[in-house]
C-alpha cells in the first residue's frame, strides 16, 4: 500500500450489511414518542436510568439499534466534490422511527491561497479529500444513538457530513485549468440534503443543521439556504434550525498583530477577506445586502449575520474560545500571564458575553477550550445549573410552544445561558484541565495560578479576598 | 519498500555551491510533499525547505533562504536541493524525508548525504 | 515560528524504569481532533526514525512500551520500561504550520 496511512484514529470497522427493511409510508405517523422533561425536573438521573432501560429492551426490535456506527456513502453527482476533485459524501445512520433529522458539519480551519492549500494538502488531506476515508465513523456526543450520552436527539437520524472543502463551508468553485482546488462547501451541503430527501429526509419534521468550528460558522452561513432549498423543491413543512458550535467568532483586535503568513496567525478579517476571493464565497443573500461589494466577510462573523437570519439558531460558544485566542495570537503554555494578556483576556470573555446579550437561544460557559456537541462528555458542562442537552431540549419546547419571537423564558425551562463570571473556567463545570506533564488533573484555583492569574487581582472586583475566593473555588462554587 | 536516496554531498569552499539529490521509489512520489532536514555535527536536526506534492509551493527556513532552491521532478521520482552561497554553518548531514499526508510527520528518512563548507 | 522546546535536555534512568521526556510548543499545535506533533529516535550514525505520530498513534512495528500523549501546546513521551537498545537521542517536531520545526533534542542514557 505505498506506506500510505490512513485516518487510523478513527474506528474503522467493516460498514454494516446492507438494510433491507421497507421504509414507512409516506405520511404516516412514524416520529418517536416526545419525552416532556416537566415531569421529572427535580429527579432527572431517575429518569434517565428509566429511559436507558427502556431504550435497552427496545434494541432487539430495532436492528439498526445495533450498531453506532455511521456508514460513508460518496455522492452520486461526483460533479459536487472536495479540494482535490474527489466526491464529496456523508456519513449516515438511519433510525427509521423518527422524524428528526441532525446534519453535523465537521470543523478543520480553512486555507486561503495556494500556498497554504498546497501545504495542507500534503499534512491534513483528509480535510481536502475522499480518498482515505474512512468506511464508518462511530457518533459521538450529540450524534450518539446512546441515551446516556445524548439525553438530547439520540434517537435522530444521524449525518456527518466531512469537511473537506477547506472554504468554511461557503465555497461554490470547481476545480478548473485555472483552479488547483474544488472550494464547494455551500454546494456541497445542498447536494447531500438532496440526496437524504430520497432516503427519508423528505418526511422529516424537524432538520437541525449542527457544526462545530469552522462547522459553526458553516451553520450559521448555510442554515437559510438549506431552509430556502427545501422550500423550493416542495418540503415547506420541514421545520430547518441551526446549532452552532464554536463557530461564534469576533472580528476584534489582536493581542499581538502579525503578518497575514499562514492560516493560524493571520487576523480572522484578513483570512477571510482573502478566502472569499479565492473560494468564491457565498453568504447569506439578507447578510450580503447590509454590506458593500467586497465586504461579504463581514457575514462570517456571528454577531453580524445572526440578525439577519430566518431560521431559528441556538448558539453555543466557549466564552474563552482556543481558536478564538489563536487567531489573536495569545498561547497561553503554562507560563505567567503578564497583567497586559490578563485583562485582553478578560475583555475577550467580555466582548463576545456582549455579542450574545440579543441571541435567545445560547450557550456560552466560561471556560477556556474548544467545540462541545460531538464530544462524549458535551452532558457534563452547565450554565447556571442547566446542561447544554437540557438548554437544547428547552429551546424545542420553546419553539414547538411557539415562542420563537417571545423572549420569554418558559418556566423552569431557560434557553439564553451566558456565564457571567470573568475569568476562564471560574465556571467549576468547566472541561477538566490537566498538567500536561505531571497528567494531574487541575482545580480552578490551581489552573488560575498556573496560568498566572494573581488571585489578589482576581478576587478584588468580586469583593472577595483571596483566601475567600480559593475556598470557593476549590468547592466548586 | 519505500526508499530514499540521497547523493551530492561533498566538500566545498565558502561561497561555492552544491546540488543535492534525492532518488525516491517503492511509493507514488507525486503524492507525497517533500522535505530537507539537515543535521550539523553534534547537534540537533533543523528543517530547511519543503516541496509541495504538485511542486507548485515552496518554503524555506528563515536560514538558507535566498541561497537555497528546492525542485522536484514528479516524472524521474527525483527531489533536488540547489545551494549556493554556501557558509561554514551550512556544514550538515542532508537527508530528505516523505511526510504523510495523514499529518505531515517524516514516515521515511535517507540515509543522508554529509555537505562540508570549509576552505 | 512555533517554537519547540524539550526537557530535559539530557536525561539518564536506570534498565526497566520509566523514562519521560516532555515537549511544549509556544502556541497550540492542535486542530479539528488532531495534534500534529510527531516523536523520532535517533541512533549515532543513523537516520531519525518515527516512533509516535499525531500525538499518541505508535507507529508500526515500534514496541508497545512507547508511548506519547498531551494535546495543546504541551506533549509527553513515555517509555514504560526503558530497554539498553532505547538508549538515542529523541525529537519532538510539529506540523501543524510551515516551517516546521523541532525541539531541541533530548539524550536518553542509562544510569
Known amino acids: 500500500s505505498e506506506g500510505r496511512k490512513t485516518w487510523r484514529r478513527r474506528g474503522q470497522q467493516p460498514p454494516p450489511p446492507p438494510r433491507t427493511e421497507a421504509a414507512p409510508a409516506a405520511g404516516q405517523p412514524v416520529e418517536s414518542f416526545p419525552l416532556d422533561f416537566t415531569a421529572v425536573e427535580g429527579n432527572m438521573d431517575s429518569f434517565m436510568a428509566q429511559v436507558k432501560s427502556l431504550a435497552q429492551s427496545l434494541y432487539p426490535c430495532s436492528a439498526q439499534q445495533l450498531n453506532e456506527d455511521l456508514r460513508l456513502h460518496l455522492l452520486l453527482n461526483t460533479s459536487v466534490t472536495c479540494n482535490d476533485g474527489s466526491p464529496a459524501g456523508y456519513y449516515l445512520k438511519e433510525s427509521r422511527g423518527s422524524r428528526r433529522w441532525l446534519l453535523f458539519l465537521e470543523g478543520g480551519w480553512y486555507c486561503f491561497n495556494r500556498e497554504n492549500c498546497d501545504s495542507r494538502y500534503d499534512t491534513m488531506r483528509r480535510l481536502m479529500s475522499s480518498r482515505d476515508w474512512p468506511r464508518t465513523r462511530t457518533g459521538t456526543g450529540i450524534l450518539s444513538s446512546q441515551p446516556e450520552e445524548n439525553p438530547y436527539w439520540w434517537n435522530a437520524n444521524m449525518v456527518f457530513i466531512p469537511y473537506c472543502s477547506s472554504d468554511v463551508w461557503s465555497g461554490a468553485s470547481s476545480k478548473s485549468e485555472k483552479n488547483e482546488y474544488a472550494f464547494m462547501g455551500a454546494l456541497i451541503i445542498q447536494e447531500v440534503v438532496r440526496e437524504l430527501l430520497g432516503r427519508g429526509l423528505s418526511g422529516a419534521k424537524v432538520l437541525l443543521l449542527a457544526g462545530s468550528s469552522a462547522g459553526g460558522t458553516g451553520v450559521l452561513l448555510n442554515v437559510d439556504r438549506v431552509a430556502e432549498q427545501l422550500e423550493k423543491l416542495g418540503y415547506p413543512a420541514i421545520q430547518v434550525r441551526g446549532l452552532a458550535d464554536s463557530g461564534w467568532f469576533l472580528d476584534n483586535k489582536q493581542y499581538r498583530h502579525t503578518d497575514c503568513v499562514d492560516t493560524i496567525t493571520c487576523a480572522p478579517t484578513e483570512a477571510i477577506r482573502r478566502g472569499i476571493r479565492y473560494w468564491n464565497g457565498v453568504v447569506p443573500e439578507r447578510c450580503r445586502r447590509q454590506f458593500q461589494e467586497g465586504e461579504e466577510w463581514n457575514c462570517f462573523f456571528g454577531y453580524k449575520v445572526y440578525p439577519t437570519l430566518r431560521c431559528p439558531v441556538f448558539v453555543v460558544q466557549w466564552l474563552f474560545d482556543e481558536a478564538q485566542l489563536t487567531v489573536d495570537n495569545v498561547h497561553l503554555t503554562g507560563q505567567p500571564v503578564q497583567e497586559g494578556l490578563r485583562l485582553y483576556i478578560q475583555n475577550l470573555g467580555r466582548e463576545l458575553r456582549h455579542t450574545l446579550k440579543d441571541v435567545p437561544a445560547s450557550f456560552a460557559p466560561a471556560c477556556l477550550s474548544h467545540e462541545i456537541i460531538i464530544r462524549s462528555h458535551w452532558t457534563d458542562v452547565q450554565v447556571k445549573g442547566t446542561s447544554l442537552p437540557r438548554a437544547l431540549h428547552c429551546w424545542d419546547r420553546s419553539l414547538h410552544d411557539s415562542h420563537k419571537a417571545s423572549k420569554t423564558p418558559l418556566k423552569g425551562c431557560p434557553v439564553h445561558l451566558v456565564d457571567s463570571c470573568p475569568w476562564p473556567h471560574c465556571n467549576p463545570s468547566c472541561p477538566t484541565v490537566r498538567d500536561q506533564f505531571t497528567g494531574q488533573e487541575m482545580n480552578v484555583a490551581q489552573f488560575l495560578m498556573h496560568m498566572g492569574f494573581d488571585m489578589q487581582t482576581v478576587a478584588q472586583p468580586q469583593g472577595l479576598e483571596p483566601s475567600e475566593l480559593l475556598g470557593m473555588l476549590s468547592n466548586g462554587s | 519498500q519505500v526508499q530514499l536516496v540521497e547523493s551530492g554531498g561533498g566538500l566545498v569552499k565558502p561561497g561555492g555551491s552544491l546540488r543535492l539529490s534525492c532518488a525516491a521509489s517503492?511509493?507514488?512520489?507525486?503524492?507525497?510533499?517533500m522535505h530537507w532536514i539537515r543535521q550539523a555535527p553534534g547537534k540537533g536536526l533543523e528543517w530547511v525547505s519543503y516541496?509541495?506534492?504538485?511542486?507548485?509551493?515552496?518554503y524555506y527556513a528563515d536560514s538558507v533562504k535566498g541561497r537555497f532552491t528546492i525542485s522536484r521532478d514528479n516524472a524521474k521520482n527525483s527531489l533536488y536541493l540547489q545551494m549556493n552561497s554556501l557558509r561554514a554553518e551550512d556544514t550538515a548531514v542532508y537527508y530528505c524525508?516523505?511526510?504523510?499526508?495523514?499529518?505531515?510527520?517524516?514516515?521515511?528518512w535517507g540515509q543522508g548525504t554529509t555537505v562540508t563548507v570549509s576552505s | 515560528d512555533i517554537v519547540m522546546t524539550q526537557s530535559p535536555d539530557s536525561l539518564a534512568v536506570s534498565l526497566g524504569e520509566r523514562a519521560t521526556i516532555n515537549c511544549r510548543a509556544s502556541k497550540s499545535v492542535s486542530t479539528s481532533g488532531y495534534s500534529y506533533i510527531h516523536w523520532y529516535q535517533q541512533k549515532p550514525g543513523q537516520p531519525p526514525k518515527l516512533l509516535i505520530y499525531l500525538a499518541s498513534d505508535l507507529e508500526s512495528g515500534v514496541p508497545d512500551r512507547f508511548s506519547g500523549s498531551g494535546s495543546g501546546t504541551d506533549f509527553t513521551l513515555t517509555i514504560s520500561s526503558l530497554q539498553a537498545e532505547d538508549v538515542a537521542v529523541y525529537y519532538c517536531?510539529?506540523?501543524?504550520?510551515?516551517?516546521?520545526?523541532f525541539g531541541q533534542g533530548t539524550k536518553l542514557e542509562i544510569k
Open positions: 516541496s509541495s506534492s504538485g511542486g507548485t509551493t515552496v
Open positions: 517503492g511509493f507514488t512520489f507525486s503524492d507525497f510533499g
Open positions: 524525508a516523505r511526510a504523510s499526508y495523514d499529518g505531515g510527520y517524516f514516515d521515511c
Open positions: 517536531h510539529h506540523s501543524r504550520e510551515l516551517p516546521f520545526t
